[in-house]
Interface confidence: low
Amino acid sequence: GELETSDVVTVVLGQDAKLPCFYRGDSGEQVGQVAWARVDAGEGAQELALLHSKYGLHVSPAYEGRVEQPPPPRNPLDGSVLLRNAVQADEGEYECRVSTFPAGSFQARLRLRVLVPPLPSLNPGPALEEGQGLTLAASCTAEGSPAPSVTWDTEVKGTTSSRSFKHSRSAAVTSEFHLVPSRSMNGQPLTCVVSHPGLLQDQRITHILHVSFLAEASVRGLEDQNLWHIGREGAMLKCLSEGQPPPSYNWTRLDGPLPSGVRVDGDTLGFPPLTTEHSGIYVCHVSNEFSSRDSQVTVDVLDPQEDSGKQVDLVSAS
């Protein structure tokens, strides 16, 4: 007869490992007992369990509660055992010794491989600001056995660098994603993808990019200067900008205080019925935690009577 086993048994951390050992004998042969031991190189054999045809299963104290026979029905020639809740320390060489009658003893070895799936972590880099050079956006670390693969999935343009640290029974892989921050990256996902033979599917951790910036400011409302005449109601100036974090707006007048009746409402400056007092240089000041911008415009309130007088002069001059 002969023993049937596997060269390598692979399980994921925490799963049950079936250690196969089946005696394929001739008709009439019987298995008296099966002894399982751990036999790592350089260390003495450590008994796991003994399966006796008459007395049943005996588990050594070191493995008490962790070694069982497979559930019934059982073939009397099957000496396989289950190692419950495999841990990383279980990885190594195992041997089964089968005592048969009348053929004698047989032995076979297998290697137990315990996969330790990674628990990845993503750490965002320092605050991203538009205008910075190449900056760390995020780093992703995953430790497992064997070493996991760490990659990035994103539409954002950037560069990656990886490094690995080997430990006694595992390896930690860290990948960094660097980019040149721009406002278009705001809200874009940066996903760390971790692959490992112990995972049914890739693990993904998504970080949303947040880039501080402040756009140039501009003022709208003076497109048609002829509308800015004495008596006009509802005149307003609107300050245009965008930023992250969202900016705040402040209005001042360069050549004196804001005239009475002028209302400041965030990005908008509202005027009462226009008078010549409203002529002047107005400044919109936009700021956020990242930066500040100014935009100034000159308001020149026209007097229709003066204008009509000028037109008459021009006509008479021609």
Partner: antibody, heavy 125, light 107 residues
Framework: EVQLLESGGGLVQPGGSLRLSCAAS????????MSWVRQAPGKGLEWVSA???????YYADSVKGRFTISRDNSKNTLYLQMNSLRAEDTAVYYC???????????????????WGQGTTVTVSS | DIQMTQSPSSLSASVGDRVTITCRAS??????LNWYQQKPGKAPKLLIY???SLQSGVPSRFSGSGSGTDFTLTISSLQPEDFATYYC?????????FGQGTRLEIK
Amino acid sequence: EVQLLESGGGLVQPGGSLRLSCAASGFTFSSYAMSWVRQAPGKGLEWVSAIYSGGSTYYADSVKGRFTISRDNSKNTLYLQMNSLRAEDTAVYYCTRHGGDSGSWSYYYYGMDVWGQGTTVTVSS
Amino acid sequence: DIQMTQSPSSLSASVGDRVTITCRASQSISSYLNWYQQKPGKAPKLLIYAASSLQSGVPSRFSGSGSGTDFTLTISSLQPEDFATYYCQQSYSTPLTFGQGTRLEIK
């Protein structure tokens, strides 16, 4: 006026398919990220799927492989193709817009600031 | 996935009361936290974005605070129209997740 209007809901048997549509108006649709969020009867809100302005798509585990989100920027319309429907997919489905005052950046930071009125999907035999 | 836990699940209060609802994330989400109000038969409405920023058109009696894992929505003086269900939602990473909701009822 900024508006989202869902359609396409109805009664369907388990294993069947439906396609939801969401017509957007009043804003530059192509600049914004959009999501579908659902609410089962008497239950809380559950995010279903998102699509970025660039076309990247994301799904909740509960619908991955069964639902497909897409957009047609020329028609200002968001879609949700729902296949292999189950009883637990029964819900009101809302179309939502991500973004604050400017849709050109910071999709997630602002949360979902515009919601449709919802369309009801009932999966039952 | 990031889990969001709201407390309390329901709350009874009177008009004029100061009300606080809390939301806890299972991991740090910086300030990527939004609050919504939903009335029966209606779509949710965004109240607060980025943990503490008041959405345009929302009354100033609503305020938000917090960062990292712990967040708070406060209504300084409850009005009759504020009785509704309130949800928090993280926008730090996909899948986007909501709290289970807090139902605010009239005492």
